[in-house]
Each structure stands twice: as structure tokens, then as C-alpha cells.
């Protein structure tokens, strides 16, 4: 029987009974937070062969092996992953081995096995036989291998039963437990699965099969399952569903997603039966099962019950995520916040139409309104007292409304009001009048020329770049020396730069008044010689990357109306030179005959330019005569140490430090100090662990149902 849509077993181990009739779990399986150690020996689910999403085990006391629970679990498809992982075993205090001796394939995703203080038999499993790429696996903080003394079946009797493979240059026996070998298919099967008797399965089988070369005898399907047969693609008039089976139109019409409203069920799109139209598509009518492309962002109408939606935090903005039409009024009042501009853009950046008015007041955290990056129409169906539909009052750091060169905004009805915005130049407001079609609507007091822009460099001159030079990780630029009316008023220059894959950035992108800024800033002092052009060397850049750069002059000069005069450049786009690419990833080689090797790899993570070709080199190696000869009968060779506590990176202090070759001199000395790169890597690793743990906790700790 198919079970799902995801099974969460927590608190009470007897809930495991829910798995009794499952052959396939269409979705995930969580077993977690069972704090009382129980006897799991009476629980066995031999029918379960496939999990279509992921398996997560977390804090299950008393469970020592998964082999008895799931003796026939063969495939974890990873159609949806838990933080990039298809198998997560985390903080399982009593788990001694994984023991999933029939697990043959994890189709997508990696594994994360962490902080399991008593867990052994990890180094004896060759994960490359189960996963395509092992580079993303994370196996950390478990019982140290040298404390485990893992023995594969028959090793003690010197009649080893398991096969050997090489991992990290170590050729060794592969097993799941002391009495279960890791199954390997004959090389003649290639990528195909095999039966218990080593006969090759049908190419459409995955994991295993009950009879050779028979597409109806598969334990799981490589591609799709339909009416008892494994098929490479779904037959006509059937549709892919949940990544593993084919269903007909009626089936798809008959199911609802947990998130959908009463009337909206699943849709059929691109040969798949799915919960919702994919990004960029919308249903062809409210009751339709089919998707059509959206023109521009897909419309989503959001309505505020109380007519006016107050945006005073990221949390309140979050409610508008994905909205394109907002029925009501927007009151924006952002006094403080972290990374506020990009957060607001994330949640409000798709709004195109506001049917009422927009009011921005006391929003001292805002530098620009560009976070409303798609706003094109304010209808003004409801207006503030005085017939205002756009009202901007007391925003101490607001410098830009929008980039009017790339913005069409219409205010259909109502007037604009601007007051007490000391960094907002009046010219910017007048430009908005022109663009929005409100010129002539405002009366004299609606745009205050005294208290708008009183503390800004509103009369800007243009700085011109004079030269640019690039290398793979450096840019040198120079610009004309700016000469304000009084030379003494020129203090310095500030250079702003950032990665810009596209030539569409503006000065205010990602900038807020609370310190967040997507631009890197460098101060450049004036050259002592008045005739030398100012310039800067930007270093530590990425190869073959386009950067946006602009320069501002920092001045003191006041001109008419006590407004500050300043200067800045246009935004310059400049690309660093190409460099050597990083190494290709996930290199795999396999032999498919006595005279051929098939080598596969993924592109480098940093191409550092346009890749034109790869060079593959190979050479014949002498047969490795070294065989594993450790005698487990002499137990004294296995260091006996304290029980592992499942923590990570605890360095043990020993009385006699190891002798290391350090800095070219032989002899006893301290361990070499860690390089900056190693320290950075450790820091990133610790950060990554924290992020994962937070994700885990946030995902699984939920309020009790009412």
C-alpha cells in the first residue's frame, strides 16, 4: 500500500504501527523525539521498500539499528529533500549501526549523519555505491572509527564474506553490520540493479528485483511506475506524480493539495500532475486544471480586511509575499531593522498595483523606495484627508524615491504630499510629478522646498572616470579630480563597488539607513599633489566577474538656499580577467569492459571564465599489492578510550604531543599552527552546522494541535 503524504512519528513509539501496511511512503518519513528508551524488537516493517522523499531520524532513545525496523528498504528517492539531504540521522543516542542492509540507492540528495555518540559501521559502508556523488555527504561527530573496531562478517574467522572496494585509497571490506555485507552487483550489470542471486535486473529497475530482466519484477523503478510496470516515461494520457508514478487525468482532478483552497486541486502541466502551477504560470481559470504562462509576474490579489495595511517590520511585510495587486492602502512606518531594504524587496517587490493610497512616514530606516520595484500604478480609490494618495512625511534618511530612468509609475487619482524629508532632493520630487502625471495637482504647500533636501547634496556635478585596468582579481581605476568652488571643501572620495552580473543596478540597491548596504565602500584620500588624478586599486576580486563601480566626492560646500553641492560618477561596469578554473567536481570512473573506462564529472564550481574544453589524463597504475592485515584478535592494538559523547571538534590534550615534521625541520615540536584558510574553513563549517541545526529544530518542533 502507498502511504503518505509524509509520515511523522514522534513522542510515542507505538505510532510506528502506522507503517504496518506501507510498501511505498509517498513523501517523507520522520521518526523523532521519542525520549523513553523502548524495546523496538517487536516492530518490523518488511513491506516498506521505497521512500519517495527523505528519511529523518532524530533523538529516538533505545533504537540500536534500523535493520530490524526496515529490513527491505531499498530506495530513498529524494524527490524532496530535508536541507539537501535524503537521509538524516542526528543525535540518535543509542544507535550502534545503520544496518539498512538492503538500501541500494539514494536517487537524489546527500546524507547527513551527525552527533550519534555510539554509531559505528560508518567507514565500512561504501556510499558511492548508493549515491551518485558522495562529496556532499556530511558524516561528523559520531563514534570515532578506531573506537568501533568494526568487523565485517567472517573477518574474525579469516573467512571474509563481504566484497572489497576502495574509499580514500583504502581497499577494504564493505558491510552494514557484524553480520550483513553491503550488497554489490556484478560488474557485468553496469549501472543496473541485481537480484539476491546476482542476476541483472531490467534496466528500468532501481535497487533490486525479484526476477532478472523483467520490468514487472522491480522492487522500485528507475523512472516511473504505472499499472505494475516500470516505464521510462509515463504513457499517453497519464502524468508524472510525486516523481515516481504515473496517474491519469481523473486521479489528478480528484486530489487536493494541503495548501490549496476548497476549489483548487492539482494541475496538469508539462506532463506532470502537480500541486500548483510552477513559477511563471497561472491556472487558465479558477476551476481549470491547466496552466498558462503569466505575462510578467503572475497576478496574486491580496486584500487587507481593515483596508489599511501597516508595514512596520519585516514580519508585517512578509504577509505580502507574492502579491502583485494590493486591494487597500499601504502605510509604511519602518523605524529600524536589519537588512531592511532587501527584506522588504523580497516580500513587497512584486506589488504592481495599490488600489488605495500609499503613505510613508517616520521610516527612518529607508534610504530609497526602490524595494517597491514593480509598483506601476496607485489608483487612489481611497485617499487621505486633503485628497492625498501618495504621502511622504518625516523620513530622516530617505534619499531616493525610485530610479526614474527605469520606472513608470502612474498615480491615477489624488495628490502627493512631501514634508520633512531632509535628504530627499526637491528635484527628485519634481521628477516624480512628471513621471506619475500628478504635475499641476499639487498646491504650493504640498511639496515643501525648505525642509525637503535640506541636508542633501542636491546639486550634483558628474565625476568622470579617466582610466581602468583589470587583472584576474584586481581593478585599477582613476577619475578626474573634482574641483568644487572652494577647493578646501573637498574632503575625500568614496568608491562603491559590488558584483553585478547584469547592468541593472542602482545606487540604492539593498541600502538602508541601519548600516545594511549591498555595496562595498572604500574611502580614498585626496592625492597630496593637486595635479595627480585620484584613483584606487580594488583587490581580492573574483576572476571573470562583472563589477559595478561608482565614486562620490565628499564635500562641505553650501550653495544657494543652503543646499550642499556634491559630485558623483555614473555607474561603471567592468569585468575582471579570466583565470584558471577550479577543479572539476565529483569525478567518477567505472569500467564497462576489459578495455574501457567511463569517466564522468561535474563542471567546476568556479569556472573563472568561459570553459571551452576539459583535459583528461590517465596512466596505468601497478596493481596495489597492499592488503588490509589488521589482526582484530589482538585487541590491544585497538585503543580503548572513553565513550564518545557525540560532540565535535573537541581536541584531546595528551601528555606527549606527537612528533611532527614542522617547517622543514625534523624533531618533536608543536602541531603546526592552522593557516588562515584552515581557520576560515573551520569557522564556515561551524556556521554551517549551526544553520543546519537551526533548520532541523525549526522544521520539527511544532506547536501541539489544539
Amino acid at each position: 500500500e502507498i502511504c503518505g503524504p509524509g509520515i511523522d512519528i514522534r513522542n510515542d513509539y507505538q505510532q510506528l504501527k502506522r507503517l504496518e501496511n506501507c510498501t511505498v511512503i509517498e513523501g517523507y518519513l520522520h521518526i523523532l523525539l521519542i525520549s523513553k528508551a523502548e524495546d523496538y524488537r517487536s516492530y518490523r516493517f518488511p513491506k516498506l521498500t521505497v521512500i519517495t522523499e527523505y528519511l529523518l531520524l532524530f533523538r529516538v532513545a533505545g533504537l540500536e539499528s534500523l535493520g530490524d525496523l526496515f529490513p527491505n528498504l531499498t530506495v530513498i528517492r529524494g524527490w524532496k529533500l530535508f536541507y539537501n539531504y535524503a537521509l538524516v540521522i542526528f543525535e540518535m543516542t543509542n544507535l550502534k549501526d545503520i544496518g539498512l542492509y538492503n538500501l541500494r540507492n539514494i536517487t537524489r540528495g546527500a546524507i547527513r549523519i551527525e552527533k550519534n555518540a555510539d554509531l559505528c559501521y560508518l567507514s565500512t559502508v561504501d556510499w558511492s555505491l548508493i549515491l551518485d556523488a558522495v562529496s556532499n555527504n556530511y558524516i561528523v561527530g559520531n563514534k570515532p572509527p578506531k573506537e568501533c573496531g568494526d568487523l565485517c562478517p567472517g573477518t574474525m574467522e579469516e573467512k571474509p564474506m563481504c566484497e572489497k572496494t576502495t574509499i580514500n585509497n583504502e581497499y577494504n571490506y564493505r558491510c552494514w553490520t557484524t553480520n550483513r555485507c553491503q550488497k554489490m552487483c556484478p560488474s557485468t550489470c553496469g549501472k543496473r540493479a541485481c537480484t539476491e542471486n546476482n542476476e541483472c535486473c531490467h534496466p528500468e529497475c532501481l535497487g533490486s528485483c525479484s526476477a532478472p530482466d523483467n520490468d514487472t519484477a522491480c522492487v522500485a523503478c528507475r523512472h516511473y511506475y504505472y499499472a505494475g510496470v516500470c516505464v521510462p516515461a509515463c504513457p499517453p494520457n497519464t502524468y508524472r506524480f510525486e516523481g515516481w508514478r504515473c496517474v491519469d487525468r481523473d486521479f489528478c482532478a480528484n486530489i487536493l493539495s494541503a495548501e490549496s483552497s476548497d476549489s483548487e486541486g492539482f494541475v496538469i502541466h508539462d506532463g506532470e500532475c502537480m500541486q500548483e502551477c510552477p513559477s511563471g504560470f497561472i491556472r487558465n481559470g479558477s476551476q481549470s486544471m491547466y496552466c498558462i504562462p503569466c505575462e510578467g509576474p503572475c497576478p496574486k490579489v491580496c486584500e487587507e480586511e481593515k483596508k489599511t495595511k501597516t508595514i512596520d517590520s519585516v514580519t508585517s511585510a512578509q504577509m505580502l509575499q507574492g502579491c502583485t495587486i494590493f486591494k487597500g492602502n499601504l502605510l509604511i512606518n519602518i523605524r529600524r531593522g536589519n537588512n531592511i531594504a532587501s527584506e522588504l524587496e523580497n516580500f513587497m517587490g512584486l506589488i504592481e498595483v495599490v488600489t488605495g493610497y500609499v503613505k510613508i512616514r517616520h521610516s527612518h530606516a529607508l534610504v530609497s523606495l526602490s524595494f517597491l520595484k514593480n509598483l506601476r500604478l496607485i489608483l487612489g480609490e481611497e485617499q487621505l484627508e486633503g485628497n492625498y494618495s501618495f504621502y511622504v512625511l518625516d523620513n530622516q534618511n530617505l534619499q531616493q524615491l525610485w530610479d526614474w530612468d527605469h520606472r513608470n509609475l502612474t498615480i491615477k487619482a489624488g495628490k502627493m504630499y512631501f514634508a520633512f524629508n531632509p535628504k530627499l532632493c526637491v528635484s527628485e520630487i519634481y521628477r516624480m510629478e512628471e513621471v506619475t502625471g500628478t504635475k499641476g495637482r499639487q498646491s504650493k504647500g504640498d511639496i515643501n522646498t525648505r525642509n525637503n533636501g535640506e541636508r542633501a547634496s542636491c546639486e550634483s556635478d558628474v565625476l568622470h572616470f579617466t582610466s581602468t585596468t583589470t587583472s584576474k582579481n584586481r581593478i585599477i581605476i582613476t577619475w578626474h579630480r573634482y574641483r568644487p568652488p572652494d577647493y578646501r571643501d573637498l574632503i575625500s572620495f568614496t568608491v562603491y563597488y559590488k558584483e553585478a552580473p547584469f547592468k541593472n543596478v542602482t545606487e540604492y540597491d539593498g541600502q538602508d539607513a541601519c548600516g545594511s548596504n549591498s555595496w562595498n565602500m572604500v574611502d580614498v584620500d585626496l592625492p597630496p599633489n593637486k595635479d595627480v588624478e585620484p584613483g584606487i586599486l580594488l583587490h581580492g576580486l573574483k576572476p571573470w566577474t562583472q563589477y559595478a563601480v561608482y565614486v562620490k566626492a565628499v564635500t562641505l560646500t553650501m550653495v544657494e538656499n543652503d543646499h550642499i553641492r556634491g559630485a558623483k560618477s555614473e555607474i561603471l561596469y567592468i569585468r575582471t580577467n579570466a583565470s584558471v578554473p577550479s577543479i572539476p567536481l565529483d569525478v567518477l570512473s567505472a569500467s564497462n569492459s576489459s578495455s574501457q573506462l567511463i569517466v564522468k564529472w561535474n563542471p567546476p564550481s568556479l569556472p573563472n571564465g568561459n570553459l571551452s574544453y576539459y583535459i583528461v589524463r590517465w596512466q596505468r597504475q601497478p596493481q596495489d599489492g597492499y592488503l588490509y592485515r589488521h589482526n582484530y584478535c589482538s585487541k590491544d592494538k585497538i585503543p580503548i578510550r572513553k565513550y564518545a559523547d557525540g560532540t565535535i571538534d573537541i581536541e584531546e590534550v595528551t601528555e606527549n604531543p606527537k612528533t611532527e615534521v614542522c617547517g622543514g625541520e625534523k624533531g618533536p615540536c608543536c602541531a603546526c599552527p592552522k593557516t588562515e584558510a584552515e581557520k576560515q574553513a573551520e569557522k564556515e563549517e561551524a556556521e554551517y552546522r549551526k544553520v543546519f541545526e537551526n533548520f532541523l529544530h525549526n522544521s520539527i518542533f511544532v506547536p501541539r494541535p489544539e
Epitope: 502507498i2 501496511n21 486530489i255
Partner: antibody
């Protein structure tokens, strides 16, 4: 075309048993429960029971627990209902109707009905 | 068992008239997940029943938009905005929320 073809009319004696069939075509048989519904002459409809073709799991209306037994034959995409210890009260038209087999959320309706089998119990 | 009570038993109408049929359940048929499995079926003389409305108010594909369903909790209504000759027959409400699933007694829509 999706169809549920039911077996022909049955005339049976009181106390006897009868097995009626419902052959599915045009869809994946194992994706839907098979339900059976009774309609006595001039009366309303009564849900009898349903069966999961994958594993033979059944749900019965307690009223029919001792009267009806449901089975399936996956190889021929056919569902069966056996009625035993028949009395005149069992004289009715019996319909099969499919209902999606999906553990998540479903619209849960009988979207396809069989043609109906008339069972007459008479001595 | 959940008893489904339909009123009226018979509904004589003229073609083009509006028609309304009521169905009341003896207890709430709202499931714990918030879904209400209330359907309406039409059975024409000598035919099998056919699905019209599912989950209170959703029209099944191919059902004309003159049919509409409404209600919540225990009270439900089927409305036909302009009755046509092909609409004549017996209408049944059905609850699929609690086992045993139950049908209403039926309402016969006939010409005056």
C-alpha cells in the same frame, strides 16, 4: 474511456448466495477504491462497503457486515461482491462506483458509476 | 450513523424556474482537517447516479453553471437557477466524512 461494466441481472432463491462483478477499464484499477451502493426499488441509495484493490483492505457499513463480502482480482481489473443468506429485503439494484485511493487530501467523490446489477430474491 | 434529511421530497417546477433543495445532517460533517465531504448526485430514470457538486460548492467538470451548492456544518443547499428539461430526476445529497457514508432520502424534481 473510463467504464465500470457490471454483470447481468440475477434471480436467486431465499437463503442462497450470489456473486456480482464489476469490471473496470480505461484507468489504473489500483488507484481507486471500489465502492458498492444498494438501491431498493423506489427507495434511496445506501452505501454498502468499499475495497482497496492494492491489498484487499475493506470498510463496511455495519448494517451489511454479515451480508456482503468484497474481493478483487487485480489481474482482470475486476471487483466482486458476494451477498449471502439472501432474503426479499436484499432485492435491489447494486451499483459499483469508484472513489480515489489517495492518502493525502482528496475531493472524495463517486465520479464513475457502474451500470447497475439487479438482484431479485424470490422463491 | 449520520442521518441525511432532504426537503422537500418532491419539487414540482416549471421550466425556466429557480429550484432549491435542502439537506440537513444529524451531526456536523466537517472533518478534523476542515474538509466537508458533501456531494450532490442526480439520478435520471433508468440511469446510474451522476455527480453534480462535491465538497459543498464545487461543480464537477461538465456540470452546467446553473447548478450551485452552498452551506456549512449541518445545513446544505443545492440551487438550480433556470430549470431545463434535462435536469429532471431524483437529487440525492451524500456525506463522505464519516463511516458509514450516507445518502439523503432524495428529492424528485418534476414538471408542474
Amino acid at each position: 474511456e473510463v467504464q465500470l461494466q457490471q454483470s447481468g441481472p440475477e434471480l436467486v432463491k431465499p437463503g442462497a448466495s450470489v456473486r456480482i462483478s464489476c469490471k473496470a477499464s480505461g484507468y489504473a484499477f489500483t488507484d481507486y477504491y471500489m465502492n458498492w451502493v444498494k438501491q431498493s426499488h423506489g427507495k434511496s441509495l445506501e452505501w454498502v462497503a468499499n475495497i482497496n484493490p492494492n491489498n484487499g483492505g475493506t470498510n463496511y457499513n455495519q448494517k451489511f457486515k454479515d451480508k456482503a463480502t468484497l474481493t478483487v482480482d487485480k489481474s482482470s481489473n475486476t471487483a466482486y461482491m458476494e451477498l449471502r443468506s439472501l432474503t426479499s429485503e436484499d432485492t435491489a439494484v447494486y451499483y459499483c462506483a469508484r472513489w480515489i485511493l489517495y492518502y493525502g487530501r482528496s475531493k472524495w467523490y463517486f465520479d464513475v458509476w457502474g451500470t447497475g446489477t439487479t438482484v431479485t430474491v424470490s422463491s | 450513523d449520520v442521518l441525511m434529511t432532504q426537503t422537500p421530497l418532491s419539487l414540482p417546477v416549471s421550466l425556466g424556474d429557480h429550484a432549491s433543495i435542502s439537506c440537513r445532517s444529524s451531526q456536523s460533517i466537517v472533518q478534523s482537517n476542515g474538509d466537508t465531504y458533501l456531494e450532490w448526485y442526480l439520478q435520471k430514470p433508468g440511469q446510474s447516479p451522476k455527480l453534480l457538486i462535491y465538497r459543498i460548492s464545487n461543480r464537477f467538470s461538465g456540470v452546467p453553471d446553473r447548478f450551485s451548492g452552498s452551506g456549512s456544518g449541518t445545513d446544505f443547499t443545492l440551487k438550480i437557477s433556470r430549470v431545463e428539461a434535462e435536469d429532471l430526476g431524483v437529487y440525492y445529497c451524500f456525506q463522505g466524512s464519516h463511516v458509514p457514508y450516507t445518502f439523503g432520502g432524495g428529492t424528485k424534481l418534476e414538471i408542474k
